[in-house]
């Protein structure tokens, strides 16, 4: 017997659609191979319809699609606009028709549910408002208008012009008669629930001569979208539910057992603690749309979503809705990355962001995470040499190592910088990652004078001092711009007696500027790193005076000023704008970048965990 | 709470016929899945049937075990799903559940029990050789 599985029988109506799903074995094989349905003839054959490999019979074409979830181990056949012609037997299978595994199905489409002749049909979606139009002739214009629905064999009244509304519809029926004019009433429902479709019946006056009028209503569930993304990637929920709800609070929810939606995120500021640091709501439009990006996707995470409006900020009754069916593919395109880095106060973090690496020309970014309202991403810096004011001097993002990896190095940590951050592109959204960045008791392990002044004309010696933990690493001087930092020569002056219990492992090594000028002002960097990965740094400023009295300066630890957890950057910058990304494609509005920079000198940055992986500041 | 309550088991021959109802309670599912389990002594539980519905359009499921001589339906007003047993076999003597889920989007695997979020008490069948 075949292990594929899936329905025996289908059975729907004209215009429907019908969502078919084959199960197999998710095998290596099996995942990879062809998935086709086919419609079998009178003499045996069975010819394809559809399948995996892009075909699409013209009998379908612009009608059918066929997902194959590898993860999940089943492969669905979408067809819309079914007609009675569709009606027949099939197979959905793996591999070659004749021979391969398939399982049986029987579609039959009928035409129709049974409507009273001059039967009106009304087709809505769960939540939103339908019209039913009740005309009615003249002799019956001072007469009780009324709507029933037909329960069983009985009609039930619903609602009339002397004022009764049925309890399952109060606050969201009317009945409206039209002016003079016209010579028919309408009854708006709104908030259409699933439980309102069946037939109706509308009547003006109350003896034999009144005038009636059937009414077919169907309540339409939302089918899911599928949605099929990769572990650690990242998934966007676009919602669109249309202007009469754009005042409405919005929410996504997961759904859980039975008809229960958990809260995922809502605009009334509430949020799943399993998404803290990796889920943003954009700013709706007016129109009502909204979306909600999810990163650092998890196994956990794969089920069904739904999107809605509701005054409560989650699923009721006649929420107008939208859904998903997440797949969260675990053989995923996105390698692993630590998602918490730990450093130390005054100390440093370099975080690893990988990327497409088929879009290594595209612009990187890193942007903070912030909480509150709807959570926001402020930019902080950016491969084109932007980097916003206060992190002047500590932040920096480079390219390296390259080959779907870049390295943003963060120093002179305080407390404050503890948070969510996110690595992203302008390129393949799928590809946004989170970090959690924590700040862990510990001193930093290099060792540099605080800030340093220069004599213009003079020479100065700069030290820095690296543990023997760091013996096997290169270190290295730059000078930091907003482009990067760019290596400078140094000095090694032999083992440093700055470290207790450390051996001749130790070093001290010297950035010596020779005949300083006002261009050597600026932040200097001591760091270490093996190859293209880049492990602590540490900071210092250089401010160039006036000379005052003749020499070269060598500045030594002792001289250094206020600890790192003191230093306030740019504190007398006035604050420029205040603009949170809501791109570069965070949500696939294609906003251009540059207008979307956040220059506020207040806020800070952020990035978000997916597993408990966890990086120190220094190791790679 | 929805509550599933079978009925139709008893004593039958090899060869014959039974039909099994399962009524819930509440409000008409407008989408959902309902459907049939059974456990006989010292055996795990295992899947039957199940009909999902959504509008105006059904899916029905069986397993090999039961193809043929099976047949599940539902009768949408009165909020109940029937499994019609034809050809009962000895190795068909069982405890029959009946399994519901309600839900606006269509769940996953029919035949795994963990896609159902109400069971009935069950009802035995014996098919007796």
């Known amino acids: 017997k075949s292990p594929i599985f899936g329905p025996e029988e289908v059975n729907s109506v004209e215009g429907n659609s019908v969502s078919i799903t084959c199960y197999y074995p998710p095998t290596s094989v099996n995942r990879h191979t062809r998935k086709y349905w086919c419609r079998q003839g009178a003499r045996g054959g069975c010819i394809t319809l559809i399948s995996s490999e892009g075909y699409v019979s013209s009998k379908y074409a612009g009608r059918a699609n066929l997902t194959n979830f590898p993860e999940n181990g089943t492969f669905v056949v979408n067809i819309a606009q079914l007609s009675q012609d569709d009606s027949g037997r099939y197979k959905c299978g793996l591999g070659i028709n004749s021979r391969g595994l398939s399982f049986d199905v029987s579609l039959e489409v009928s035409q129709g549910p049974g409507l009273l002749n001059d039967t009106k049909v009304y087709t809505v979606d769960l939540g939103r408002t339908v019209t039913i139009n009740c005309p009615f002739k003249t002799e019956n214009a001072q007469k009780r208008k009324s709507l029933y629905k037909q329960i069983g064999l009985y009609p039930v009244l619903v609602i009339d012009s002397s004022g009764y509304v049925n309890p399952n519809y109060t606050g969201r029926i009317r009945l409206d008669i039209q002016g003079t004019g016209q010579l028919l009433f309408s009854v708006v429902i709104n908030q259409l629930r699933l439980s309102d479709a069946g037939q109706y019946l509308c009547q003006a006056g109350d003896d034999s001569n009144s005038n009636k009028k059937n009414a077919d209503l169907q309540v339409l569930k939302p089918e899911p979208e599928l949605v099929y993304e990769d572990l650690r990637g990242s998934v966007t929920f676009h919602c669109a539910l249309g202007p009469e709800v754009a005042n409405v609070a919005k929410f996504l929810c997961r759904q859980s057992s039975g008809e229960n939606c958990d809260v995922v995120v809502n605009t009334l500021g509430k949020r799943a603690p399993a998404f803290e640091g990796r889920i943003l709501l954009n700013p709706q439009d007016k129109d009502g749309s909204f979306s909600v990006v999810i990163t650092g996707l998890r196994k956990e995470d794969a089920g069904r979503y739904l999107c809605g409006a509701h005054s409560d900020g989650q699923l009721q009754e006649g929420s107008p809705i939208q859904a998903w069916q997440l797949f969260v593919n675990e053989e995923s395109t996105i390698p692993r990355s630590p998602t918490v880095v730990k450093g130390v106060a005054g100390g440093s973090v370099a975080v690893l962001c990988p990327y497409n690496r088929k879009e290594s020309k595209s612009i990187k970014y890193w942007c903070l995470w912030e909480g509150a309202q709807n959570g926001r991403c402020p930019l902080l810096v950016d491969s084109e040499g932007w980097v916003k004011a206060q992190y002047e001097g500590r932040l920096s993002l480079l390219e390296e190592p390259g080959n779907g990896t870049f390295t943003v190095i963060l120093n002179q940590l305080t407390s404050r910088d503890a948070g969510f951050y996110w690595c992203l592109t302008n390129g393949d959204t799928l590809w946004r990652t989170t970090v959690e960045i924590k700040i862990i008791e510990g001193e930093p392990n290099l060792k540099v004078p605080g800030n340093v002044t220069a004599v213009l004309g003079e020479t100065l010696k700069v030290p820095c001092h690296f543990p023997c933990k760091f013996s096997s690493y290169e270190k290295y001087w730059c000078k930091w711009n907003n482009t990067g930092c760019q290596a400078l020569p140094s000095q090694d002056e032999g083992p440093s007696k700055a470290f207790v219990n450390c051996d001749e492992n130790s070093r001290l090594v010297s950035l010596t500027l020779n005949l300083v000028t006002r261009a050597d002002e600026g932040w200097y960097w001591c760091g270490v790193k093996q190859g293209h990965f880049y492990g602590e740094t540490a900071a210092v400023y250089v401010a160039v005076e006036e000379r005052k009295a003749a020499g070269s300066r060598d500045v030594s630890l002792a001289k250094a000023d206020a600890a790192p957890d003191e230093k306030v950057l740019d504190s007398g910058f006035r604050e420029i704008e205040n603009k949170a990304i809501q791109d570069p494609r965070l949500f696939a509005e294609e906003k251009a970048v540059a207008d979307t920079r956040d220059q506020a000198d207040g806020s800070r940055a952020s990035v978000d965990s997916g597993s408990s992986e966890e990086q120190g500041g220094s190791s790679r | 709470q929805v509550q599933l309550v079978e009925s139709g088991g008893g004593l039958v021959q090899a060869g014959g016929s039974l039909r099994l109802s399962c009524a819930a309670s509440?409000?008409?599912?407008?989408?959902?899945?309902m459907g049939w389990f059974r456990q006989a002594p010292g055996k795990e539980r295992e899947f039957v049937a199940a009909?999902?519905?959504?509008?105006?359009?059904?899916?029905?499921y069986y397993a090999d075990s039961v193809k043929g001589r099976f047949t599940i339906s539902r009768e949408n007003a009165k909020n109940t799903v029937s499994l019609q047993m034809n050809s009962l076999k000895p190795e068909d003597t069982a405890v029959y559940y009946c399994?519901?889920?309600?839900?606006?989007?269509?769940?996953?695997?029919?035949?795994?029990?963990?896609?159902?979020?109400?069971w009935g008490q069950g009802t035995l069948v014996t098919v007796s050789s």
């Open positions: 399994a519901a889920r309600q839900s606006l989007v269509a769940g996953g695997d029919p035949r795994g029990q963990s896609e159902y979020d109400y």
């Open positions: 509440g409000r008409a599912f407008s989408s959902g899945r």
């Open positions: 009909i999902s519905w959504s509008g105006h359009t059904t899916y029905k």
